[in-house]
């Protein structure tokens, strides 16, 4: 029975050339988190494994940093980084929980953070 919910940083924006922290939090379940995947579309950015720690995909090593916590830091942002990002929590015994974050990378110096929201 999957009872958990994922809270994410929601719709966020950041300046071109800057950095942003993507964060998700799983609550309302006692399931054990075995691994968290960070994905952009169908591309794997990074993995945080309970056993083995962090693994950053080779193609993103220069611009992705692990943390804080189970979150992910994107650096040297470009307009091409605009889009959907997903945190996938692999848990036992519940299974898979997915959270969505939409990032907009702005040319201007004004980047406002969106509201937090929940995905059941």
């Amino acid at each position: 029975m999957m009872t958990g919910t994922i809270e994410t940083t929601g719709n966020i924006s950041a300046e071109k050339g800057g950095s942003i922290i993507l964060q998700c939090h799983l609550s309302s379940t006692t399931a054990q988190v075995t691994q968290v995947n960070w994905e952009q579309q169908d591309q794997l950015l990074a993995i945080c494994n309970a056993d083995l720690g962090w693994h950053i995909s080779p193609s993103f090593k220069d611009r992705v940093a692990p943390g804080p916590g189970l979150g992910l830091t994107l650096q040297s942002l470009t307009v091409n980084d605009t889009g959907e990002y997903f945190c996938i929590y692999h848990t036992y015994p519940d299974g898979t929980y997915t959270g969505r974050i939409f990032l907009e990378v702005l040319e201007s110096s004004v980047a406002e953070h969106g509201a937090r929201f929940q995905i059941p």
Partner: antibody, heavy 119, light 107 residues
Amino acid sequence: EVQLVESGGGLVKPGGSLKLSCAASGFTFSNYAMSWVRQSPEKRLEWVAEISGGGSYTYHPDTVTGRFTISRDNAKNTLYLEMSSLRSEDTAMYYCARKRRDYYAMDYWGQGTSVTVSS
Amino acid sequence: DVQITQSPSYLAASPGETITINCRASKSISKYLAWYQEKPGKTNKLLIYSGSTLQSGIPSRFSGSGSGTDFTLTISSLEPEDFAMYYCQQHNEYPWTFGGGTKLEIK
């Protein structure tokens, strides 16, 4: 080339025990979670155990909990399945399989080892 | 547990044809369904995972679609080596469960 080679199967009486092994090669064994899956004589597939890459976390379905134990020796690149209190319904071909690094599905399987539980 | 119903259990087709195999889950499994090919004397091969993602090295004539409870494996322009047993498996929640299999034979 990724290779998984199972061994240790055989004929065992009901209530008996058996320990299966799976020798892995061609990849960094400790980086991957591993599973055991069995296939009944009727060709039904059933997941029976999983272990995390470092061996800290193990998972079993209710059908085998308390009877089957999965373990691994990363120094020897070997996966194990210790089976006790065996029943006739445990008769199957047992496969070890590697989980994808992203935890989606099992990307490599062994050729299997046969276990027959019969008096 | 999530029950997976796979259909048909048997399918006869000719090389060059396009076929579809279906799997239905007893409840939503999001996109998390995998497809495997089983052939005598060979190890099981992962074809598709997460519903539609093609495993590296698998020919593009294999494709997967669906989400929620209904999923389809399509093999277009069947090649002689495609005649085999096919299984689906949900990887959304424990315990992982499989469909009953589809035997694809040459007509």
